[in-house]
């Protein structure tokens, strides 16, 4: 018997206080399948309908989350907030349910939603003004001639508060990219009641026109390319409609600010990308070697000439031919399209290199992840400790700490009878989470499992987001288990960047019951197994001070491979003393971020290394011990013969050779291991 939990609709930000009540209507989500009928907008038709409202909200330009915010920005210790107006997408013409912006659109920040169309399509925008003053919806692509021909009144370029207006136009060939250009071309839409004031107040969004048969019918976007629109501008709050109100909010009486004071003016100017300053724009997350298209926009006066640079990467522009570039000069009112194949995993910066702009915070970070870096984060191994796993409640002894994949015993999982339950994992630091493996459990003759669930996540434990991923609806509902023992691997594509992961059962059998593993990597995608277990590191690359041989067994260095099975399935030195070492030659400089160690067990004897040192060398002759906090780091190794233990290297080692020096052990020195890291990357 499958029990269903009812959920209520999701907001972009949820103030999460350990309860959830989300009501799911069928049209709110899809469960992997591409059932176009579920979508509030149907993208197969030639008319693409968008419901967009002007909505007022408070904005802090990311200052509350920036560690770099200048002291003088914050008065009396608080971060100033500014009333702004933004284009907000809704699910339908009732304008009651905002369309939740998932991971793929999170980067838009202050920008309105993407409006996408192909040549010959019709675009219909139903615009509602939910703000307190008149605004409009305007794009240079919209043709108003028909209105004139039909003898209609001249176009009113504003919509009063609480009024709705529908705009309809056909995408002409001249609006589209030429055959020599990239598949899609960027334009903008904004409000033109007073173009300058409207934009400085926040009303602008990207409008993409594409070649025919480019957009996926189910998703309404090009699924083979990941798109990011970046709007570089200096927001001047003195030019906002809400300037007076914002000044009163941020400078309480008696306020003795002088309007002409340069410091005052500078405090009301924000050198922003999509409305965020100083590396705070979220959502720029992309896969290594995946095609990325950047739409670069600038608006405003001539001071909004920007010199755009992506650290560590080149990009291409296409005008008849493709040109590789490292810098792009962006002029106001010009929307440029560039593409990139990010080849280097890690965290990089996109910035305007004009000194004043860069100094003032016109930069942000983009994260390139490697799809190869997907390892268990430690539920099964115990690397994720008991205290990191909490839940809304538990049934009897079925505690959250038991929610570990493959856990065995008569009570071997987390379980709860509560209808609105959740289980939370604190990874202690932000990680890239690529997927989740789930498993149910048995109690006597009953199969207990979660058949459907949703995922929420957070970087700080306060602001929570519901995972939407590639779903065409407002959130992704994952199919879980169908029995008590099988393992279901659900992939997060795009991956989740979070410290905290919440799993919320929506359907379950008898009780919500779970064993799980999280698959992921560190933020730099640099905790990949370098090849001990997989044998990508050859036998010849593994050497040692000595090794033990017996009549029918050789415990050679090449046996020091994590999870190796067989009779002599580890490295053992000839003698057990602290002078012995095991060495790996990577044959080129690698970035080493961790080591996983494991002991070994013969029939009755457990053998493992309890403590070890690490040294490194670039030439194989000069060796340096790994130091931390000014002293040689003694790594805590294994506590049994079978459980792998991960030790992180902080800071990471850039090295060709690595040595493990066992310092204390149980019974005998015996070692199986993996080295974690990635290729060392040249920065340019």
């Amino acid at each position: 018997e499958i029990t269903r939990t009812t959920l209520q609709s999701d907001q972009e930000e949820i103030d999460y206080d350990d309860t959830i009540s989300v009501e799911m209507k069928k049209e709110d989500f899809d469960i992997y399948d591409e059932d176009e009928n579920q979508s509030p907008r149907s993208f197969q038709k030639k008319t693409r309908h968008y419901f967009i409202a002007a909505v007022e909200r408070l904005w802090d330009y990311g200052m509350s989350s920036s560690p770099h915010v200048l002291r003088n920005r914050a008065q009396s210790g608080s971060v100033p907030q500014f009333k702004k107006v933004v284009f907000q997408e809704f699910t339908d013409g009732s304008f009651t349910q905002p369309l939740y912006r998932g991971e793929l659109n999170e980067h838009l920040g202050l920008l309105g939603p993407y409006i996408r169309a192909e040549v010959e399509d019709n675009i219909m925008v139903t615009f509602r003004n939910q703000a307190s003053r008149p605004y409009s919806f305007y794009s240079s692509l919209i043709s108003y001639e028909e209105d004139q021909r039909q003898g209609a009144e001249p176009r009113k370029n504003f919509v009063k508060p609480n009024e709705t207006k529908t705009y309809f136009w056909k995408v002409q060939h001249h609006m589209a990219p030429t055959k020599d250009e990239f598949d899609c071309k960027a334009w903008a839409y904004f409000s033109d009641v007073d173009l300058e004031k409207d934009v400085h107040s926040g009303l602008i969004g990207p409008l993409l026109v594409c070649h025919t048969n480019t957009l996926n019918p189910a998703h309404g976007r090009q699924v083979t390319v990941q798109e990011f629109a970046l709007f570089f501008t200096i927001f001047d709050e003195t030019k906002s409609w809400y300037f007076t109100e914002n000044m009163e909010r941020n400078c309480r009486a008696p306020c003795n600010i002088q309007m002409e004071d340069p410091t005052f003016k500078e405090n009301y100017r924000f050198h922003a990308i999509n409305g965020y300053i100083m590396d705070t724009l979220p959502g720029l997350v992309m896969a290594q070697d995946q095609r990325i298209r950047w739409y670069l926009l600038s608006m405003g006066s001539n001071e909004n000439i920007h010199s755009i640079h992506f650290s560590g990467h080149v990009f291409t522009v296409r005008k008849k031919e493709e040109y590789k570039m490292a810098l792009y000069n962006l002029y106001p009112g010009v929307f440029e399209t560039v593409e990139m194949l990010p080849s280097k995993a890690g965290i990089w910066r996109v910035e305007c290199l004009i000194g004043e702009h860069l100094h003032a915070g016109m930069s942000t970070l983009f994260l390139v992840y490697s799809n190869k870096c997907q390892t268990p984060l430690g539920m099964a191994s115990g690397h994720i400790r008991d205290f990191q796993i909490t839940a809304s409640g538990q049934y009897g002894q079925w505690a959250p700490k038991l929610a570990r994949l493959h856990y065995s015993g008569s009570i071997n999982a987390w379980s709860t009878k509560e209808p609105f339950s959740w289980i939370k994992v604190d990874l202690l630091a932000p990680m890239i989470i690529h997927g989740i493996k789930t498993q149910g459990a048995r109690q006597k003759f009953s199969s207990l499992y979660i058949s459907q669930f949703i995922i929420m996540y957070s970087l700080d434990g306060k602001k929570w987001q519901t995972y939407r991923g590639n779903s065409t609806g407002t959130l992704m509902v994952f199919f879980g288990n169908v029995d008590s023992s099988g393992i279901k691997h659900n992939i997060f594509n795009p991956p989740i960047i979070a410290r905290y992961i919440h799993l919320h059962p929506t359907h379950y059998s008898i009780r919500s019951t779970l064993r799980m593993e999280l698959m992921g990597c560190d933020l730099n995608s640099c905790s990949m197994p370098l090849g001990m277990e997989s044998k990508a590191i050859s036998d010849a690359q593994i050497t040692a001070s000595s090794y033990f041989t017996n009549m029918f067994a050789t415990w050679s260095p090449s046996k020091a491979r994590l999870h190796l099975q067989g009779r002599s399935n580890a490295w053992r030195p000839q003698v057990n003393n602290p002078k012995e070492w095991l060495q790996v030659d990577f044959q080129k400089t690698m970035k080493v971020t961790g080591v996983t160690t494991q002991g070994v067990k013969s029939l009755l004897t457990s053998m493992y290394v309890k403590e070890f040192l690490i040294s490194s060398s670039q030439d194989g002759h000069q060796w340096t011990l790994f130091f931390q906090n000014g002293k040689v780091k003694v790594f805590q190794g294994n506590q049994d013969s079978f459980t792998p233990v991960v030790n992180s290297l902080d800071p990471p080692l850039l090295t060709r050779y690595l040595r493990i020096h066992p310092q204390s052990w149980v019974h005998q020195i015996a070692l199986r291991m993996e080295v974690l890291g990635c290729e060392a990357q040249d920065l340019y």
């Epitope: 009779r567 003698v575 013969s602 029939l603």
Partner: antibody, heavy 117, light 108 residues
Amino acid sequence: QVQLVQSGAEVKKPGASVKVSCKVSGYTLTELPVHWVGQAPGKGLEWVGSFDPESGESIYAREFQGSVTMTADTSTDIAYMELSSLRSDDTAVYYCAVPDPDAFDIWGQGTMVTVSS
Amino acid sequence: EIALTQSPGTLSLSPGERATLSCRASQSFSSSYLAWYQQKPGQAPRLLIYGASTRATGIPDRFSGSGSGTDFTLTISRLEPEDFAVYYCQKYGTSAITFGQGTRLEIK
């Protein structure tokens, strides 16, 4: 738990052969080699030889070469030691033992072989 | 082939005393390959020490092993009544395995 159970005592005439068995339980025979050790009455321990059921390879002590054969039946997890051309000085208790992992950690209870005319 | 010689042949001590048993090899070898066994009448030998100094599982800490090269020692720090038995040293390894002739530890 891991156990080695040997076959019962044997009385043989000189020139005959004897086959002593050693049944392992608690693990699979191919996991470890089987060593055989003899102990004549009132005397010390003497290594006879070793057999690796995984590879079928055997190593015999010089004194026993030509008169001992070690085999195994991996389907039943039984190791065998056959002594041929028995002489009266072959009278001894024969032990099977397995290394865990190196020295002889696990021993059978011993099989008394008496060679007497 | 390496020969092992144990001394003394017989050691007579009282409970509570310290026993030191010696094992000398005809040529040097790695201490990794030296073991000590205890054998009581009518029983199979029992492993005490391997790798010259590592106690086997379940062996009381009054038993300790030391030595390298050609000279190895088994020490019983404080004799208990159940420790009176015959003790053998053994050289194991990659080829031939040899035992010493044994030291009988008897109650004085």
